[in-house]
């Protein structure tokens, strides 16, 4: 069953180069991998590796391909009908409450706990209490993220020149 994407679902994107014309819209909609022309008469193909559309639509522009960020690896490239698939790099996972970030997996469990689940791109290692078998949630305290510079002798003056 196809979902319908409408024009307000996306920010407009400028077309960089002439695109190949396709068949006329069917009942005002263009097939996946295409968008509709401004006059509504033609279906224009998306540009491979640059933009895409996944469903029958009346978009004036295709959707821009996602670029994997520096903490991710590309599992599959963007095609005219499917967006790029990105996954957190090895040893990191995507937190539910911060889905835009890949966080480092812990490498060990706190004292008194044993590891029952490995690091995956979707989850940190899983630890349970040895006796009770209850799950541990939250950070190992030593890895908490608050910010300061390490104390120590100042390095050297760091002024800006020019």
């Amino acid at each position: 069953e196809s979902a319908l994407i409408t024009q307000q679902d996306l920010a407009p994107q400028q077309r960089a180069a002439p695109q190949q014309k396709r068949s006329s819209p069917s009942e005002g909609l263009c097939p996946p991998g295409h968008h509709i022309s401004e006059d509504g008469r033609d279906c224009i193909s998306c540009k491979y590796g640059q933009d895409y559309s996944t469903h029958w639509n009346d978009l004036l522009f295709c959707l821009r391909c996602t670029r994997c960020d520096s903490g991710e690896v590309e599992l599959s490239p963007c095609t005219t009908t499917r967006n790029t698939v990105c996954q957190c790099e090895e040893g990191t996972f995507r937190e539910e409450d911060s889905p835009e970030m890949c966080r480092k997996c812990r490498t060990g469990c706190p004292r008194g706990m044993v590891k029952v689940g490995d690091c995956t791109p979707w989850s940190d290692i899983e630890c349970v209490h040895k006796e009770s078998g209850t799950k541990h949630s939250g950070e190992v305290p030593a890895v908490e993220e608050t910010v300061t510079s390490s104390p120590g002798t100042p390095a050297s003056p760091c002024s800006l020149s020019g």
Partner: antibody
Framework: EVQLQQSGAEVVKPGASVKLSCKAS????????IHWVKQAPGQGLEWIGR????????KYDPKFQGKATITTDTSSNTAYMELSSLRSEDTAVYYC???????????WGQGTLVTVSS | EIVMTQSPATLSVSPGERATLSCRAS??????LHWYQQKPGQAPRLLIK???QSITGIPARFSGSGSGTEFTLTISSLQSEDFAVYYC?????????FGQGTKLEIK
Amino acid sequence: EVQLQQSGAEVVKPGASVKLSCKASGFNIKDTFIHWVKQAPGQGLEWIGRIDPANGNTKYDPKFQGKATITTDTSSNTAYMELSSLRSEDTAVYYCVRGLYTYYFDYWGQGTLVTVSS
Amino acid sequence: EIVMTQSPATLSVSPGERATLSCRASQSISNNLHWYQQKPGQAPRLLIKFASQSITGIPARFSGSGSGTEFTLTISSLQSEDFAVYYCQQGNSWPYTFGQGTKLEIK
């Protein structure tokens, strides 16, 4: 308390190599990324590269590839950066930096000043 | 590589006033932009992550905004300890790059 304690200042001759150390305390380096950042005298910051101590995977800025080599010794919770074929333009303060996420740097060492001079 | 451009290079502001620092990326970096403060003879410290997210221990007078290519760091009421050099850094793609810095000085 999280700390990154860097080795002391170095004066080295052109063409020589130097290995800087960064001893972490208050956390296990395998649970983080360790980056190195350069700051030439009176200049801005330049990212050199990063290591994931859990698996040894490294990434470098292409302009430091071949110049810098980042390693870790997880048994001593210490990161290292070796700089080779030193020239006067390598004179700078070098910071080791921690990140729980790769994207940004939450704790900084105090810096090591490397002076290349004949 | 992505080039980060900060403006102005030097900003003179009186204590108690508001300071606005700008950072521009040469291409879109979403919200993957981070701000640091550096005082003479010290290491930088993280002020803001992901364009607008606050950091534990950093005073609330520091705030960030922006997305895509244009970003702003605002210090609402300058204190004497805020006069320093401020750097932006993109973490969106390799290699990571910093802006050249904005020196905030007392007017």
